[in-house]
Every structure is written in C-alpha cells, then in structure tokens.
C-alpha cells in the first residue's frame, strides 16, 4: 500500500493534477499547490500529502503557494493566490526554515 507509512488516519482528497490516477486520493492530509513557472500561467494542483508537512507552513511567494487541510475533500473548492511581485531585495525565499 503506497500510503502505508503515513501518520494517523487517512483522509480522502480531491485529486486534480496530471499525475492523478483518479478524481480522489487518500493521504494523511489534503493539499493545494499553486505554482508559476517562468513565462507560464500559474498551475493549481490538488492532491494528497503524506510527507514533509513543513511545506504547509511555508509563506506564499510570487512563484508558489502551498495549502493543506485535514478533512474530507477539504481541498475541493480552495483557490490560492500568489504574492505580488516584489523588488529583488525584498523577495522572500522559498526555503521555509
């Protein structure tokens, strides 16, 4: 079972990304990830989290925003935004430590 080593009870989440095997997945928590790659429109992916919960605590940047929640299909209707572009000297890093 690929999610055997997850902490606590599993939750069912909406799965919307190119790598989803179906409309839902099961994991330790639900995720929404909004990513903007250079020169492209932001992509919003929904899925399940089992590792590195610290990503959920990272602050949004102009390139990425991570959101996590812990209840049944809680990621279904969540919409994220990115931080507005900041001057280079004020840009937050992606490292959340």
């Amino acid at each position: 079972d690929p999610v055997k080593p997850s902490r606590g009870p599993l939750v069912t989440c909406t799965c919307e990304s190119p790598h989803c095997k179906g409309p839902t997945c099961r994991g330790a928590w639900c995720t929404v990830v909004l990513v903007r790659e250079e020169g492209r429109h932001p992509q919003e992916h929904r899925g399940c989290g089992n590792l590195h919960r610290e990503l959920c605590r990272g602050r949004p940047t102009e390139f990425v925003n991570h959101y996590c929640c812990d209840s049944h299909l809680c990621n279904h209707n969540v919409s994220l935004v990115l931080e507005a572009t900041q001057p280079p000297s004020e840009q937050p890093g992606t490292d959340g430590q």
């Epitope: 690929p2 999610v3 080593p5 990304s17 790598h19 399940c48 590195h52 991570h66 490292d95």
Partner: antibody, heavy 118, light 108 residues
Framework: QVQLQESGPGLVKPSQTLSLTCTVS??????????WNWIRQHPGKGLEWIGY???????YYNPSLKSRVTISVDTSKNQFSLKLSSVTAADTAVYYC??????????WGQGTLVTVSS | EIVLTQSPGTLSLSPGERATLSCRAS???????LAWYQQKPGQAPRLLIY???SRATGIPDRFSGSGSGTDFTLTISRLEPEDFAVYYC?????????FGQGTRLEIK
C-alpha cells in the same frame, strides 16, 4: 525503471561554487508524490543530508549548510541542481541525489566525487 | 534536531549467523518514517526497510525491521556473504532528515 544521474565538475577550487545537476529518467520530477534530495558522504564517513526540493520549487536545507546551499529544479528538463558556495577542502565528498517517497529514499544516483583543491 | 545513534559501531559475525543492529533516537520519532539502508564500498546506499518494518522492493525476507518510539532494530536472520557492508538508519519525511552514523558488519 527510475534512474538518477549526477553530473558536474569533479574538481572545484577553494572559495568557488560547487555546481551539480541530477537528471531523472523513467519518471516525472513533477509528480507530487516525490521529493528530490541531495546527500553527501565525506571520504570514509557517514551520510549527510544537504537538502530537498519539491516540484513546486520549495526547498528545505540542512541548517548546518543553509547559508551556502541553493537547490533548484527545472521540470522541463526533468532535472534538479545543487549549488554550494564558498567551498573548502571540508566539502570534498561524494555527492548523491536521491528520490524520497513514502517508502524512503527509494532511488539514488551512483554518486559523484567532488574534490576541492587548488 | 533528532540524533540517531547506531550500535554497535562494528559487528563481527560469520555467514549463517543472525545479526541485530540497533538505532536509537534522541527523542520519540514516528515509526512511519524510519528507514534502513545498506552500503557497499564504492556504491550508493540501497534502501532495505522503510516505515520501520516494510521491506523495499527486491529485498530478501531475511532482512526485517522492528521498533517504536526511540528504539529500532534491523535484523538479518541468516547472514549471506553479500550482506557484509555498512548499514545506516534514517529519519525521513520531515526536516531535518537525519542518518545514523552507521554500523559496519564485517566477516569474523
């Protein structure tokens, strides 16, 4: 079959920046199930975790190296990279890249020896 | 930061014997994210056990893992010549990821 391959200079001068790239084949670096790690091993010593990157570009680093480390990802090339600045002889090591999943670090590159010397 | 301490540092045994390797954490860790690796000279580490007790793909059933809280064990029930190597435990899945210092399993 997933494969990881490190590449980059085997010799770096002191005070310069070490740069390595890990190319992933047989699987997508953009899958949300995986985290992409760098690990190093000093000659005759144990394993030291350097940091990881997620497909989103979010990174976490070993606190002892954080001030000198940058990890980046290029999903279009299915690659992720390591930069370690201001290197000294103490950074001489075999550097590995590895994929992390719920099943641990399940795939590793073969490792590349980087020597810091003038 | 959690420290993993492996013991013994070196274990000298003969083929056919049973090997018991210990990994102790400085504080309680999730058994879901404790792994064991084998490394031979000149090679990358190879995943043996994840989630404390689940064998990785292709790993023979003579390798088993157990434990909880702060104390974890890798057992090799009957040593084969190819099992003599260095073994590392690891905490993964949250930062900082840490490795034990290793146990060298050598032929007696």
């Amino acid at each position: 079959q997933v494969q990881l391959q490190e590449s980059g200079p085997g010799l770096v001068k002191p005070s310069q920046t070490l740069s390595l790239t890990c190319t992933v084949s047989g699987g997508s670096i953009s899958s949300g199930e995986y985290y992409w790690n760098w690990i190093r091993q000093h000659p005759g010593k144990g394993l030291e975790w350097i940091g990881y990157i997620y497909y989103s570009g979010s990174t976490y680093y070993n606190p002892s190296l954080k001030s000198r480390v940058t990890i980046s990802v290029d999903t279009s090339k299915n690659q992720f990279s390591l930069k370690l600045s201001s290197v000294t002889a103490a950074d001489t090591a075999v550097y590995y890249c590895a994929r992390e999943s719920v099943a641990g670090f399940d795939y590793w590159g073969q490792g590349t020896l980087v020597t810091v010397s003038s | 930061e959690i420290v993993l301490t492996q013991s013994p540092g070196t274990l000298s045994l003969s083929p056919g014997e049973r090997a018991t390797l210990s990994c102790r954490a400085s504080q309680s860790v999730s058994s879901s994210y404790l792994a064991w690796y084998q490394q031979k000279p000149g090679q990358a580490p190879r995943l043996l056990i994840y989630g404390t007790s689940s064998r990785a793909t292709g790993i023979p059933d003579r390798f088993s893992g157990s434990g909880s809280g702060t104390d974890f064990t890798l057992t090799i029930s009957r040593l084969e010549p190819e099992d003599f190597a260095v073994y590392y435990c690891q905490i993964y899945g949250s930062v900082p990821i840490t490795f034990g210092q290793g146990t060298r399993l050598e032929i007696k």
